[in-house]
């Protein structure tokens, strides 16, 4: 988890605090988007469940030219545990329907909300 | 460039069908998957389907399943939708797009209308 914090990060950040960043992050995108975020572009939806940060990294992560999101690309990198790259989807990804990335913004950040509050913060 | 141009909208009856194309230029057709996407008036952006770049997997919204078919003909760069047993419900502008990028790249779209 050391890369979590960023490059000021001088060490380790506490994966609450990693959280609490990734949850900041997606607020700043939902509030502070005009347009479409990402122009309308579709994404896989995710299962909120196990293996959800590398999911929903599988899915952004196809999304290119889209500076709104990259913040949050670098972010969910650290949350999983092996490397993702584009087109990859694992198991745990069920390809079932795509919804706009503005929305699917808005899911993660809700039920990363739910997370925090209950301190499952891994 | 990328440049998408769907063909094929217009007006039918519920239960009827109508085939969709989208002829694609500007880019590797054969590397990308392709989406068809769909905005019903005063509504917003609705997934429809999804096929892979080889033709070899396809993808459907609970919507349109077991009703809709998408295909793709790489050697002639285009995208199909046939639209089976339509539905009031089904009327919306139908959007070919390159997998995952913005509407920016997008075409002008395909109006469908299912009415009696």
């Known amino acids: 988890l050391t890369c979590l914090g960023g490059f000021a990060s001088p060490g380790p950040v506490p994966p609450s605090t990693a959280l609490r960043e990734l949850i900041e992050e997606l607020v700043n995108i939902t509030q502070n988007q005009k347009a479409p975020l990402c122009n309308g572009s579709m994404v896989w939806s995710i299962n909120l469940t196990a293996g959800m940060y590398c999911a929903a990294l599988e899915s952004l992560i196809n999304v290119s030219g889209c500076s709104a999101i990259e913040k949050t690309q670098r972010m969910l990198s650290g949350f999983c545990p092996h490397k993702v790259s584009a087109g990859q989807f694992s198991s745990l990804h069920v390809r079932d329907t795509k919804i706009e990335v503005a929305q699917f913004v808005k899911d993660l950040l809700l039920h990363l909300k739910k997370l925090f509050r209950e301190g499952q913060f891994n | 460039e990328v440049q998408l141009l769907e063909s094929g909208g217009g007006l039918v009856q519920p239960g009827g069908s109508l085939r969709l194309s989208c002829a694609a230029s500007g880019f590797t057709f054969d590397e990308y998957g392709m989406d068809w996407v769909r905005q019903a008036p005063g509504k917003g952006l609705e997934w429809v389907s999804t096929?892979?770049?080889?033709?070899?997997?396809?993808y459907y919204a609970d919507s349109v399943k077991g009703r809709f078919t998408i295909s793709r003909d790489n050697s002639k760069n285009t995208l199909y939708l046939q639209m089976n047993s339509l539905r009031v419900e089904d009327t919306a502008v139908y959007y070919c797009a390159k997998e995952y990028d913005s509407f920016d790249y997008w075409g002008q779209g395909t109006l469908v209308t299912v009415s009696s």
């Open positions: 096929i892979s770049p080889n033709g070899q997997s396809t």
